[in-house]
């Protein structure tokens, strides 16, 4: 009932709590002398379901049969309406519609750790929409039964607060959960288990790793476990990997030797525990231990390349370049590179340790036979040296690869193709494709890139250090013994018309013709490989089309003669540059008047 109900009563039959789909009879009756004043025959009783009028009747009582009530709580209120007055509330009732509890399913119990307590979970089934009480029973040895009630609205978990101990690990325990509400009760199927079935060990802790004699091959993992643990699972992986290596061990007693770790690698280690070979469950994985394995001496050999530059009649500059070893080859932090330069006939040798660079430049005589050896050193030792005989890489014309081409291949890639040299192609031992940004000054400080290609390949995709809108000088070397031949080409991965034209810096008169000199377009404005320059000229104040002269682009060329100008006529001259994508805007305009005699 929902208020004092001084004026009357509302009764509900068969009950205030009903099964979904049932019918209820609701009766509203006035108490004596509680009807309308003077007009008791005009009593009008009205029944409301929530705020909606569902029935009315003149008299002292009202009967209403109600069906189709929804799950949950429905409020009915009875009111009295008299002439010329507001409706007066008589009484009300709440009706609770629900269902009997379903059989609880999937009852399972677990004890976390040897010192933990037994907790059970189950699935309630569909909502009853009524207050439902769950009682969990656990029966076991010594004729004991523990029983605990749960008064939460949605109860699907209970912790008994009991710690099962391994005195008799094979003793059986039986759990059962019973749900009860006003409409019925239902019990789960019993779940029977032993101590070993339900105790889930705590994850191992205090994980440590030791490397005997700082060697990766003598590595032991240590940890601590609960006392009854029989089995362990170890998993480990390099920190940058997603794949785990797994090892199962029995009776490890908190230690295990690992034999397959890579040197100088950060690993993540985790361990899990179990009490019995085929009973119970694995613990959660332990917290991760992260540890770096010790260094070992480098394996593999450096990839070394070089460049020769003529200085004068007696000296040449040698620039050596090498690539870093891969992490798996370096097997540690490379502390320095050792470069040895030797004159093979005289036996003179010089050795130098290089730190922080992967290149070295020196000047040597042009005479004699020279060789270099380069190795990488970490804290444990050095790699095997890479030996190279210094030769003139482009000397053998017959070894020069033919028909070299360079084509853009997607974003920031260039496909270089060639044909084998005319000389016996089978003599080629390997090809080297070399590329560097094209700088008009031929700057030797520009980084050099190269890759090696098998003798049967006639193409290579270059992608390392390739930028869009930059022109690269590409060379293909064919190497055979102590001889080499080379061919070169310019190439870019992406191009567009240059952003500016050349800047004319001088026009000089020479024997009736003129010589135009210009400044190169800045590299960042060339937007790829230049193919041509164009020089335009026309008479000042003339509307005629300009004449032009197209010059093939050559890196070192910065001037060009023109001999078709008339004397004592003032001309306007300007220049443009072209890539395969189009022509630049005009460079600066210069006026010039040829002073020579008229023809």
């Amino acid at each position: 009932k929902i208020d004092a109900c001084k004026r009357g009563d509302v009764t509900v039959k068969p009950s205030h709590v009903i099964l979904l789909g049932s019918t209820v009879n609701i009766t509203c009756s006035l108490k004596p002398r509680q009807g309308c004043f003077h007009y008791s025959r005009r009593n009008k009783l009205i029944l409301y379901k929530f705020d909606r009028r569902i029935n009315f009747h003149h008299g002292h009582s009202l009967n209403s049969q109600v069906t189709g009530l929804p799950l949950g709580t429905t409020l009915f209120v009875c009111k009295l309406a008299c002439i010329n007055s507001d409706e007066i509330q008589i009484c009300g009732a709440e009706i609770f519609v629900g269902v009997a509890p379903e059989q609880p399913q999937n009852l399972s119990c677990i004890q976390k750790g040897e010192q933990g307590t037994v907790a059970c979970t189950w699935e309630r089934g569909r909502d009853t929409h009524l207050y439902t009480e769950y009682t969990l029973q656990l029966s076991g040895p010594k004729n004991l039964t523990w029983q605990k009630q749960c008064k939460d609205i949605y109860c699907d978990y209970l912790d008994f607060g009991i710690n099962l101990t391994p005195e008799s690990p094979e003793s059986n325990f039986t759990a059962k959960v019973t749900a009860v509400n006003s409409l019925g009760s239902s019990s789960s199927l019993p779940s029977t288990f032993t101590f070993l079935d339900i105790v889930r060990p705590l994850p191992p802790w205090d994980i440590r790793i030791k490397f005997q004699k700082a060697s990766v091959s003598r590595c032991t993992l240590y940890w601590r476990d609960e006392g009854l643990v029989l089995l362990n699972r170890l998993r480990y992986r390099p920190s940058n990997s997603r794949l785990w290596n797994m090892v199962n061990v029995t009776k490890a007693k908190g230690r295990h030797d690992l034999l397959d770790l890579k040197p100088f690698t950060e690993y993540e280690f985790q361990i899990s525990s179990k009490l019995h070979l085929y009973k119970g469950s694995w613990s959660d994985w332990s917290e991760s231990l992260r540890a770096q394995t010790p260094e070992e001496e480098p394996t593999g050999m450096l990839d070394v390349w070089y460049m020769k530059r003529h200085i004068d009649y007696s000296r040449q500059q040698i620039s050596l370049f090498w690539k870093n070893l891969s992490v798996s080859e370096a097997r540690g932090k490379i502390l320095h590179y050792q470069v040895t330069l030797q004159e093979l006939t005289g036996g003179k040798a010089m050795t130098q340790n290089i730190t922080g660079h992967t290149s070295w430049t020196t000047v040597i005589p042009r005479t004699g036979n020279w060789a270099v050896a380069v190795s990488a050193a970490n804290s444990k030792g050095s790699s095997l040296p890479t030996r190279i005989n210094i030769m003139n890489l482009c000397e053998a014309g017959l070894l020069a690869p033919r028909q070299v081409s360079a084509n853009s291949e997607g974003m920031d890639n260039i496909l270089v193709t060639w044909q084998p040299p005319r000389k016996d192609p089978s003599a080629v031992q390997e090809y080297v494709v070399e590329w560097r940004e094209l700088h008009p000054g031929g700057d030797t400080q520009v980084p050099l890139n190269w890759l090696r290609s098998r003798p049967y390949n006639v193409s290579a995709l270059i992608s390392e250090n390739i930028k869009s809108y930059i022109c690269y000088e590409i060379r293909v070397y064919a190497l055979s013994g102590d001889q080499g031949g080379c061919s070169s080409i310019l190439g870019n991965s992406k191009h567009k018309a240059p952003l500016s034209g050349p800047h004319i810096n001088a026009i000089t008169e020479e024997k009736g013709s003129i010589l135009i000199s210009w400044n190169s377009i800045p590299v960042q404005e060339q937007m790829g490989c230049l193919l041509h320059y164009r020089i335009y000229w026309k008479e000042r104040d003339s509307n005629s089309q300009p004449q032009l002269c197209e010059i093939p682009y050559r890196v070192s060329q910065n001037s060009h003669p023109i001999n078709s100008l008339q004397p004592r006529v003032t001309y306007v001259l300007w220049m443009t540059a072209l890539t395969a994508a189009g022509e630049s805007s005009h460079g600066n305009e210069r006026e010039f008047c040829l002073q020579g005699k008229a023809n």
Partner: nanobody
Framework: QVQLQESGGGLVQAGDSLRLSCAAS????????VGWFRQAPGKEREFVSA????????IRDDSLRGRFTLSRDNAKNTVYLLMNSLKPEDTAVYYC??????????????????????WGQGTQVTVSS
Amino acid sequence: QVQLQESGGGLVQAGDSLRLSCAASGRTFDTYIVGWFRQAPGKEREFVSALSWSDDTTIRDDSLRGRFTLSRDNAKNTVYLLMNSLKPEDTAVYYCAAKAKPPAATWSSYRNREWYDYWGQGTQVTVSS
């Protein structure tokens, strides 16, 4: 310090019912385990049932076949042992015992006499045939 006082014992016929009370003074039961034991003449004191007051957990000896049930009255700080279908072999002195609730108990700790810290004087129950 908890003082325990049992009451409600007496002489009954076989098949009758009896309700024993265990009232605590000096402290409320709300953080305690309350157990009932009995001791028949010439026998060891044996466990009957126990109640963990704070979380409504009950522990019973199944050999009693569910004839004995525990209840409590918070306002009176009292635990009751309702005994139905009494038999002559139920004749014994019935004791009430208490212990401060530990974080976790073992399976059979509640049935061990030595585990409890406080005991009442006992109340005699005699069942005649």
